[in-house]
């Protein structure tokens, strides 16, 4: 029960990619507003997105303080124009989110192939080290900085003339693969965190093929 015409938020859902983290919920407000609070399991509640009519709240600034912590959020519902009003229990209606551990749960963003270079029968493929919103010593950390060797990349590569995808893996951002002389190859990469049980893979990078601008060919 709560104040007349005030309903509790529901379907609280974390949407997070490369640590950019937004809490979403329902319903679209009718004569009510929302405030979000976030806390670690052992910490104090911090209020965000005060008296908003949105049904989402960007909590990135809070979760990047320690991405290995487990966070809980809650969404308070208030009557529009009367935010001091409380429910029958003496406090506003609220709903808890599921727990969220960014390090284990943030989705891996789509990677990008930065470059590839062929030297004879070897090709070096480099994956862009994407910047995150996680900070250390006032600088933004890359995905590799945050995950270290927990993050690997799987390279799919194939001759332009065939469909079978060979694979290679690296725990850096570079691959060195053997190719057949005189053949053009295409490449796509996928970020993977094998130690996870869910959200292990990113979507595939855009496909890049030899003979396009990103690559360089050198005959040795």
């Amino acid at each position: 029960s709560g104040t007349t015409n005030t309903v509790a938020a529901y379907n609280l859902t974390w949407k997070s990619t490369n640590f950019k983290t937004i809490l979403e919920w329902e319903p679209k407000p009718v004569n009510q507003v929302y405030t979000v609070q976030i806390s670690t399991k052992s910490g104090d509640w911090k209020s965000k997105c005060f008296y908003t009519t949105d049904t989402e709240c960007d909590l990135t600034d809070e979760i990047v303080k320690d991405v290995k912590q487990t966070y809980l959020a809650r969404v308070f519902s208030y009557p529009a124009g009367n935010v001091e009003s409380t429910g029958s229990a003496g406090e506003p209606l609220y709903e808890n989110s599921p727990e969220f551990t960014p390090y284990l749960e943030t989705n891996l963003g789509q990677p990008t192939i930065q470059s590839f270079e062929q030297v004879g029968t070897k090709v070096n493929v480099t994956v862009e080290d994407e910047r995150t919103l996680v900070r250390r010593n006032n600088t933004f950390l890359s995905l590799r900085d945050v995950f270290g060797k927990d993050l690997i990349y799987t390279l799919y590569y194939w001759k332009s003339s065939s469909s079978g995808k060979k694979t290679a893996k690296t725990n850096t951002n570079e691959f060195l693969i053997d190719v057949d002389k005189g053949e053009n190859y295409c490449f796509s990469v996928q970020a993977v965190i094998p130690s996870r049980t869910v959200n292990r893979k990113s979507t595939d990078s855009p496909v890049e093929c030899m003979g396009q601008e990103k690559g360089e060919f050198r005959e040795i």
Epitope: S163, A168, T170, N171, P194, V198, N199, R200, K201, D204
Partner: antibody, heavy 120, light 107 residues
Framework: EVQLVESGGGLVQPGGSLRLSCAAS????????IHWVRQAPGKGLEWVGY????????YYADSVKGRFTISADTSKNTAYLQMNSLRAEDTAVYYC?????????????WGQGTLVTVSS | DIQMTQSPSSLSASVGDRVTITCRAS??????VAWYQQKPGKAPKLLIY???FLYSGVPSRFSGSRSGTDFTLTISSLQPEDFATYYC?????????FGQGTKVEIK
């Protein structure tokens, strides 16, 4: 508990077709890779091919290329091996296996296998 | 394709014996080598991964090592349940390839 269960094996005539299924439980196949490996009677292990169920990418051994097709239905958490133009030398126990996908660990869980006999 | 040449193809040993099986890769595979145990009518089971790491639940009498492109599986003290066929496998490149297998029999 991670489990892989193959089904669909049986007796088929040369030139015939068969579809094997690999039903997974205890994990989501799109988070991993699924391989098929076969073993002819009294022989060693031979890799057949793999699929990444997340994007549908596949690769096949030369011995089956153009005849076998691996697919996956992520809604059913099941991978398939479609075998066409079967030959006597395809007679084997067919296993599906999960690829953990790290640099260190490859095939960590295997199914119990299903026997395919190609004979007239 | 990378060839994995496994030896011996079979061996006879007694309970308590130290048993060594080797695999040679035809080119560099780094440490991307696994060892599997297979008993008749059963699926292979992972024993060793990344050349030398013991997989969860595998007895410590099993060990693996690498020297360049040579890989070794050692059973320090053979137990009755260890009589089986053992396979090495490389997963450094596609296609992954297996050794021919080593059957460990009772002497």
């Amino acid at each position: 508990e991670v489990q892989l269960v193959e089904s669909g094996g049986g007796l088929v005539q040369p030139g015939g077709s068969l579809r094997l299924s690999c039903a997974a439980s205890g994990f989501t196949i799109s988070d991993y890779w699924i391989h098929w490996v076969r073993q002819a009677p009294g022989k060693g292990l031979e890799w057949v091919g793999y699929i990444d169920p997340y994007n549908g990418y596949t690769y096949y051994a030369d011995s089956v290329k153009g005849r076998f097709t691996i697919s996956a239905d992520t809604s059913k958490n099941t991978a398939y091996l479609q075998m066409n133009s079967l030959r006597a030398e395809d007679t084997a126990v067919y296993y599906c296996a999960r690829d953990y996908g790290s640099l260190e660990v490859s095939l960590d869980y295997w199914g119990q296998g299903t026997l395919v006999t190609v004979s007239s | 394709d990378i060839q994995m040449t496994q030896s011996p193809s079979s061996l006879s040993a007694s309970v308590g014996d130290r048993v060594t099986i080797t695999c040679r890769a035809s080119q560099d595979v780094n440490t991307a080598v696994a060892w599997y145990q297979q008993k008749p009518g059963k699926a292979p089971k992972l024993l060793i991964y990344s050349a030398s790491f013991l997989y969860s639940g595998v007895p410590s009498r099993f060990s693996g090592s690498r020297s360049g492109t040579d890989f070794t599986l050692t059973i320090s003290s053979l137990q009755p349940e260890d009589f089986a066929t053992y396979y090495c496998q490389q997963h450094y490149t596609t296609p992954p390839t297996f050794g021919q297998g080593t059957k460990v029999e009772i002497k």
